[in-house]
């Protein structure tokens, strides 16, 4: 798998989206889970609906929501209040049994806010009731890897 | 501020039919998944509908298979719900509500349905 | 279904009183799927407490949500008068279903 780039600015909010074939995966519920290290497990940080009809409701982990097109075969991930910490590689699964097949290999960069040399105070963050696509979503920059780059810093 | 507004309830005989409508503002709607939930008159909340912000995917309660059909016009930022083979059981205010955190996080007033001859 | 038993059915209190609401599920669901809404006569529902234990926006934190599993509860601490109503609990880890409400009332 290739690993497409993402870039968010810290402070908004970031949305990945991951294609996949509708028919290949119909019937399968998807998650969305982080690289820890280059060889690491992928530890999940939240997965679609239980009932696999209901994909299409949002499913929330703290600032992260996931959302499934089952139809037209595009799996979405939105990175609310995006952080720092947020920054690294992830991964687009669709589950079966046990076993998950990786959809798309993610690498998340955030970028420092423009703004903030501006007092913390100055800055404004939208409640629950409000919706994060109307306050803080920027159009996701996204760019594959190219062949030699590498998404993790070398250990020594 | 998201704002919700139900409109088209009323009286109907057992056996007709009624369409509600679900105005709605203050967010971008084809984004988000709707629902409709009902309240039969002194009693609790029940579950109707879902539907998806782009209206592909629908999904019922048991109770109403068959009988009612979500919908959506995300052009007209709209909500419906066609009602048919109306039953006294059906009698409710019928509310929708929109996805947040949870599934019906923002609702609306509600419009009122009676179903008696 | 999941089924949610909603007790007590009516609790009677005072202004100032703690108050606290049980609901009980017919087979586990996960917290992060579990909402708690206040009714008022011919009023539309309130989310309060979604993800078993998150206050809403605007809510006071008079109101907690906790537990797990089959049993949940929520807790007002000490109750205002704006605070008498009816409470649902909600699970959407499934289909959706919703407890049968308690009705906080005056003492």
């Known amino acids: 798998h290739n690993t497409t780039v993402f870039q968010g600015v810290a402070g908004q909010s970031l949305q990945v989206s991951c294609p996949y074939d509708s028919m290949k995966h119909w019937g399968r519920r998807k998650a969305w889970c982080r690289q820890l290290g280059e060889k690491g497990p992928c530890q999940r940080v939240v997965s679609t609906h239980n009932l696999w009809l209901l994909s299409f409701l949002r499913r929330w982990n703290g600032s992260t929501a996931i959302t499934d097109d089952t139809l037209g075969g595009t799996l979405t991930i939105t990175l609310r209040n995006l952080q720092p910490h947020d920054a690294g590689l992830y991964q687009c699964q669709s589950l079966h049994g046990s076993e998950a097949d990786t959809l798309r290999k993610v690498l998340v960069e955030v970028l420092a806010d423009p703004l903030d040399h501006r007092d913390a105070g100055d800055l404004w963050f939208p409640g629950e009731s409000e919706s994060f696509e109307d306050a803080h979503v920027e159009h996701s920059i996204s760019r594959s890897l190219l062949e030699g780059e590498i998404p993790f810093p070398p250990t020594s | 501020e998201v704002q919700l507004l139900e409109s088209g309830g009323g009286l109907v005989q057992p056996g007709g039919s009624l369409r509600l409508s679900c105005a709605a503002s203050?967010?971008?709607?084809?984004?988000?998944?709707m629902s409709w939930v009902r309240q039969a008159p002194g009693k609790g909340l029940e579950w109707v509908s879902v539907?998806?912000?782009?209206?592909?995917?629908?999904y019922y309660a048991d109770s109403v298979k068959g009988r009612f059909t979500i919908s959506r016009d995300n052009s007209k930022n709209t909500l419906y719900l066609q009602m048919n083979s109306l039953r006294a059981e059906d009698t409710a205010v019928y509310y929708c509500?929109?996805?947040?955190?949870?599934?019906?996080?923002?609702w609306g007033q509600g419009t009122l349905v009676t179903v008696s001859s | 279904e999941i089924v949610l038993t909603q007790s007590p059915g009516t609790l009677s209190l005072s202004p100032g009183e703690r108050a606290t609401l049980s609901c009980r599920a017919s087979?586990?669901?996960?917290?992060?799927?579990l909402a708690w809404y206040q009714q008022k006569p011919g009023q539309a529902p309130r989310l309060l407490i979604y993800g078993a234990s998150s206050r809403a926006t605007g809510i006071p934190d008079r109101f907690s949500g906790s537990g797990s599993g089959t049993d949940f509860t929520l807790t007002i601490s000490r109750l205002e008068p704006e605070d008498f109503a009816v409470y649902y609990c909600q699970q959407d880890d499934r289909s959706p279903t919703f407890g049968g409400g308690t009705k906080v009332e005056i003492k």
């Open positions: 509500a929109k996805e947040g955190r949870t599934i019906t996080m923002d």
């Open positions: 087979q586990s669901v996960s917290s992060s799927y």
């Open positions: 539907i998806s912000g782009s209206g592909g995917s629908t």
């Open positions: 203050g967010f971008t709607f084809s984004s988000y998944a």
